[in-house]
Interface confidence: medium
Amino acid sequence: SEVEYRAEVGQNAYLPCFYTPAAPGNLVPVCWGKGACPVFECGNVVLRTDERDVNYWTSRYWLNGDFRKGDVSLTIENVILADSGIYCCRIQIPGIMNDEKFNLKLVIKPAKVTPAPTLQRDFTAAFPRMLTTRGHGPAETQTLGSLPDINLTQISTLANELRDSRLANDLRDSGATIRIGIYIGAGICAGLALALIFGALIFKWYSHSKEKIQNLSLISLANLPPSGLANAVAEGIRSEENIYTIEENVYEVEEPNEYYCYVSSRQQPSQPLGCRFAMP
């Protein structure tokens, strides 16, 4: 059975694998693959060494130790939930069926992000949120994982929540660029829209005043500009399909104390809707 190793979303995972070269410097080819070790080779190879060097690797997968001394432990950078599973380290010792095979089970836990206290107007929408960091190299785009669901009313506190999480520390340290895409589930939006319409009708029936309807805050988004995310989400809720995708939500971590976010619609307006979170 596999030995189990654990890591949290956004952290680096470490999967140990060692061998002793028959003679110093006489390296043995090694492969790392996703999935249990098959009869030969590695399935879904993520990294490979030969008698001299690492000759194949994929983004985020590294040998941080001195592989020339037999330390072929795998480091996976900025793990995501999808990195969970069994990994095969295969020491390809020459000869028939001489290979040493090690199956290591990696369990990824979601990052701990404390949910903010809900505000009075608690319209909770469960929409998955993907947090990705884009490294600077062409082959370095990584998905870090999913944040827990938060209320629409809590979006303005997202930066503070990020700051408090271990994930944010990793992101700040790496100076990564963060992209947050918000996908609103059609069914949830439809239900939410119906509830809001129903509420608005009752409110209208009680108030007998058009002015009060106009002043109704559909969604309260504290500290965000009225033309920004609140309107984008509100427009999405009013849309025919009840689906709205904010495609380019970019949090750019340029300095340790500041998060910037630019919200733009599918049409890519010339002036992106903006919000800026300054970290105290």
């Epitope: 003679a23 110093p24 410097g25 006489n26 941080n64 592989f67 020339r68």
Partner: antibody, heavy 121, light 107 residues
Framework: EVQLVESGGGLVQPGGSLRLSCAAS????????IHWVRQAPGKGLEWVGD????????DYADSVKDRFTISADTSKNTAYLQMNSLRAEDTAVYYC??????????????WGQGTLVTVSS | DIQMTQSPSSLSASVGDRVTITCRAS??????VAWYQQKPGKAPKLLIY???FLYSGVPSRFSGSRSGTDFTLTISSLQPEDFATYYC?????????FGQGTKVEIK
């Protein structure tokens, strides 16, 4: 203490040969890659080639391929650079350096003091 | 071969100054960039490896960073012993290649 000491430099005529030695102490060259780097007078650094003494595999810069040969004697913990068909442009201080592995690639953490090779008639 | 274009080729600075040297790779080299310091008549010394990792024993005033194919060596507060020539090197592909060097002189 890790140390690399080059020797064997000197004046040689164009077309001539020279053998440089790089004696290592404080570590086993079999476990490492030994690189040769040269520096022409008043110029920058240029990688010449390397050897992994334990396995014997070598790599060379195009400018010296087929003329220079890198070898090692692990029992003496020494690497060698055999230079044949020398040209005036090979005039330089030759350094040997130890490869330091991190994230699968070598940078050079220990260097010898260098030995001057002058190719002139 | 990958070209490493280093700038400036020389600079004059005073003790206590913040000094920045940049190196641009002609193609992606991931984080496989090292920085070396060389003084006249001496062998180079490793300062930074893997773009941003400070080598053992190197003062913390030296730092390295990466932005795409641009790499930067920063000396936060120049000391008298820092006047030297600095080289970047990519060791991502064979052959490893060096920048042409930056000479840091006393103003």
């Amino acid at each position: 203490e890790v140390q690399l000491v080059e020797s064997g430099g000197g004046l040689v005529q164009p077309g001539g040969s020279l053998r440089l030695s790089c004696a290592a102490s404080g570590f086993n060259i079999s476990n490492n890659v030994i690189h040769w780097v040269r520096q022409a007078p008043g110029k920058g650094l240029e990688w010449v080639g390397d050897i992994m003494p334990g396995g014997g595999s070598t790599d060379y810069a195009d400018s010296v391929k087929d003329r220079f040969t890198i070898s090692a004697d692990t029992s003496k913990n020494t690497a060698y650079l055999q230079m044949n068909s020398l040209r005036a442009e090979d005039t330089a201080v030759y350094y040997c350096a130890r490869g330091y592995v991190y994230r699968m690639w070598d940078s050079y953490d220990y260097w010898g003091q260098g030995t001057l090779v002058t190719v002139s008639s | 071969d990958i070209q490493m274009t280093q700038s400036p080729s020389s600079l004059s600075a005073s003790v206590g100054d913040r000094v920045t040297i940049t190196c641009r790779a002609s193609q992606d080299v991931n984080t496989a960039v090292a920085w070396y310091q060389q003084k006249p008549g001496k062998a180079p010394k490793l300062l930074i490896y893997s773009a941003s990792f400070l080598y053992s024993g190197v003062p913390s005033r030296f730092s390295g960073s990466r932005s795409g194919t641009d790499f930067t060596l920063t000396i936060s507060s120049l000391q008298p012993e820092d006047f030297a020539t600095y080289y970047c090197q990519q060791h991502y592909t064979t052959p490893p290649t060096f920048g042409q060097g930056t000479k840091v002189e006393i103003k």
